[in-house]
Amino acid sequence: CKAMHVAQPAVVLASSRGIASFVCEYASPGKATEVRVTVLRQADSQVTEVCAATYMMGNELTFLDDSICTGTSSGNQVNLTIQGLRAMDTGLYICKVELMYPPPYYLGIGNGTQIYVIDPEPCPDSDF
């Protein structure tokens, strides 16, 4: 297993609709054809997997149907979008990239993107 540098923004504020997008960029040492991207969430020292996708270079990322993540790839960049976020989902979202094929296997883990999620203010009651 060889190490690889992964860069991602330090802080992102989700939209009022609970959507956060950020780029995860990896320094590929070779010509990988199969890449696996995993998003991990760290909050209060606990790490959980948010979503994961394996893709062939040049193809779209395919997450599971019920995943809250979508993404596109371009060269050594993966543009990740996480939706359905609530204020309680605020936390550090870490991008993990694995170059699966061809060998050698490379692993890179980013420093994480702190995603702040603000629940929208409830609308005041109005009379119709």
């Epitope: 923004p9 330090a10 802080v11 992102v12 504020l13 989700a14 939209s15 009022s16 997008s21 950020f22 909050a43 209060d44 204020a87 605020t90 550090l92 994480g112 702190q114 702040y116 603000i118």
Partner: antibody
Framework: QVQLVQSGAEVKKPGASVKVSCKAS????????ISWVRQAPGQGLEWMGW????????NYAQKLQGRVTMTTDTSTNTAYMELRSLRSDDTAVYYC??????????WGQGTLVTVSS | EIVLTQSPGTLSLSPGERATLSCRAS???????LAWYQQKPGQAPRLLIY???SRATGIPDRFSGSGSGTDFTLTISRLEPEDFAVYYC?????????FGPGTKVDIK
């Protein structure tokens, strides 16, 4: 080193607007956010809101909603805070601060805005 | 809105003494998002502690933070002359990112 430098003091009349700038250096501007905090004379710190320089999304304190606008210019690594319909109780020192993963650091030197007729 | 209450309002101590400052939140939040700042007259606030207990870069180890849930503490083990200032706690886990009213540490 990481530094935030703010624009100079302003004197405004009630009802006018003010726009304070905060120029960042020493780090990747779009990787972080910028928060704005104000401090009235002899008072404590009041959080006004913040902007994510990565995507331009904003989160404002409810009491200022509709009067405040925070923006960034990523070509010059500068954040701006505009406050409209100024009142005498808006007289304060306005600070910008870099928003990190779980901290506000560093802070700008502050900009005194005086609202007086 | 999470309201932060700091006590005491003023703490009068001598250099070399231990200072214990309290910050209480109106509701429980993540301790990852509690910070302490020091402010001297005419200066901008300076980050001391983030994540309730992590010291910021360049902050002397006489400053320490602790606590979780709704109760947090900033401790200055031995007061130096330059430590006499106002100290604010802040939460930034829930919008709005509120500050406490501050505790003034002055020379007895």
């Amino acid at each position: 080193q990481v530094q935030l430098v703010q624009s100079g003091a302003e004197v405004k009349k009630p009802g006018a607007s003010v726009k304070v700038s905060c120029k960042a250096s020493g780090y990747t501007f779009t990787s972080y956010g910028i928060s704005w905090v104000r401090q009235a004379p002899g008072q404590g710190l009041e959080w006004m809101g913040w902007i994510s320089a990565y995507n331009g999304n904003t989160n404002y304190a409810q009491k200022l909603q509709g009067r405040v606008t925070m923006t960034t210019d990523t070509s010059t690594n500068t954040a701006y805070m505009e406050l409209r319909s100024l009142r005498s109780d808006d007289t304060a020192v306005y600070y910008c601060a870099r928003v990190g993963a779980n901290w506000f650091d560093p802070w700008g030197q502050g900009t005194l805005v005086t609202v007086s007729s | 809105e999470i309201v932060l209450t700091q006590s005491p309002g003023t703490l009068s101590l001598s250099p070399g003494e231990r200072a214990t400052l309290s910050c209480r939140a109106s509701q429980s939040g993540s301790s990852s998002y509690l910070a302490w700042y020091q402010q001297k007259p005419g200066q901008a606030p300076r980050l001391l502690i983030y994540g309730a207990s992590s010291r910021a870069t360049g902050i002397p180890d006489r400053f320490s933070g602790s606590g979780s849930g709704t109760d947090f503490t900033l401790t200055i083990s031995r007061l130096e002359p330059e430590d006499f200032a106002v100290y604010y706690c802040q939460q930034y886990g829930s919008s709005p990112f509120t500050f406490g009213p501050g505790t003034k540490v002055d020379i007895k």
